[in-house]
């Protein structure tokens, strides 16, 4: 599931990561819009390990994947905010 | 070349355990996630454990999870599989492979194989 | 979990054939699929990944292709060689292979 979220919590991540995830082992994507106490945007993943990981947004893959995931739920959701299982 | 030299299959009881190894040589062992895959006598291939390149992340399916570990050691360019309490069902020839490039944004799957090792359970 | 049936299970074809395997997912796997090859005895081989994609080395006659929940693995013409057994594997939510495809000598 890819989610976006507008929360009025403070930043979520502690230490991010930009160690690449294969999409296969992904359960879901959180994405945290920067604002609202919080001057950056947040990715978190949730691994089909059950761990949990926050992404550095700058990371290639990941910007890669975000933009796959937009292109494919753009035709069929609103934007920003969308939930959709990793196609 | 890339090569890849299992170890440590043999006969054990049910319940019994196993810890098998894959010795890997001609690439960057610590720079690529790596897998085990099995095969029990004339089936089909089916997926154990996967592990990311740096060691801290596992990822098994439902029928080993619980009893089977995988771990590696990059200082020693080796990969492992603990197998605790074996079936009759894990019965199998134990492929250790070459996995997705942990450094990269691709989703390549499992590459490289080994020729695989043995392991009879059996009473 | 996903699901891969492939067919058909077996198949006997003549040197020169062409021969069509196909694998249908139980949900959409996004071209995330691979195509071994194995001998008896062997390790299996790695021929295509993301449902078309060529690994290095692999001769041209074999192609893959497909979308959404269906996949198809050709090879334009048998070469003796070829005679084994074929796995699809899909990799886009964990990992599942087909049942497998034996390929023999008609």
């Known amino acids: 599931v890819l989610e976006v979220y507008y929360t009025s919590l403070r930043c979520r991540c502690v230490q991010e990561s930009s160690v690449f995830i294969p999409r296969r082992f992904i359960d879901r994507i959180q994405i945290l819009p920067r604002g609202n106490g919080c001057p950056r945007k947040e990715i978190i993943v949730w691994k089909k390990n059950k761990s949990i990981v926050c992404v550095d947004p700058q990371a290639e893959w990941i910007q890669r994947m975000m933009e796959v995931l937009r292109k494919r739920s753009s035709s069929t959701l609103p934007v920003p905010v969308f939930k959709r299982k990793i196609p | 070349e890339v090569q890849l030299v299992e170890s440590g299959g043999g006969l054990v009881q049910p319940g019994g355990s196993l810890r098998l190894s894959c010795a890997a040589s001609?690439?960057?062992?610590?720079?690529?996630?790596m897998s085990w895959v099995r095969q029990a006598p004339g089936k089909g291939l089916e997926w154990v454990a996967t592990?990311?390149?740096?060691?801290?992340?596992?990822y098994y399916p439902d029928n080993v999870k619980g009893r089977f570990t995988i771990s590696r050691d990059n200082a020693k360019n080796s990969l492992y599989l603990q197998m605790n309490s074996l079936r009759a069902e894990d019965t199998a020839v134990y492929y250790c492979?070459?996995?997705?490039?942990?450094?990269?944004?691709?989703?390549?799957?499992?590459?490289?194989w080994g020729q695989g090792t043995l392991v009879t359970v059996s009473s | 979990d996903i699901q891969m049936t492939q067919s058909p299970s077996s198949l006997s074809a003549s040197v020169g054939d062409r021969v069509t395997i196909t694998c249908k997912a139980s949900?959409?796997?996004?071209?995330?699929i691979a195509w071994y090859q194995q001998k008896p005895g062997k390790a299996p081989k790695l021929l295509i990944h993301y449902t078309s994609t060529l690994q290095p080395g692999i001769p041209s006659r074999f192609s893959g292709s497909g979308s959404g929940t269906d996949y198809t693995f050709t090879i334009s013409s048998l070469q003796p060689e070829d005679f084994a057994t074929y796995y699809c594997l899909q990799y886009d939510n964990l990992y599942t292979f087909g049942g497998g495809t034996k390929l023999e000598i008609k």
């Open positions: 492979a070459r996995d997705y490039y942990g450094s990269g944004y691709e989703d390549s799957p499992m590459d490289y």
């Open positions: 592990i990311s390149d740096g060691g801290s992340d596992a």
């Open positions: 949900q959409d796997i996004n071209k995330y």
């Open positions: 001609g690439f960057t062992f610590s720079s690529y996630a």
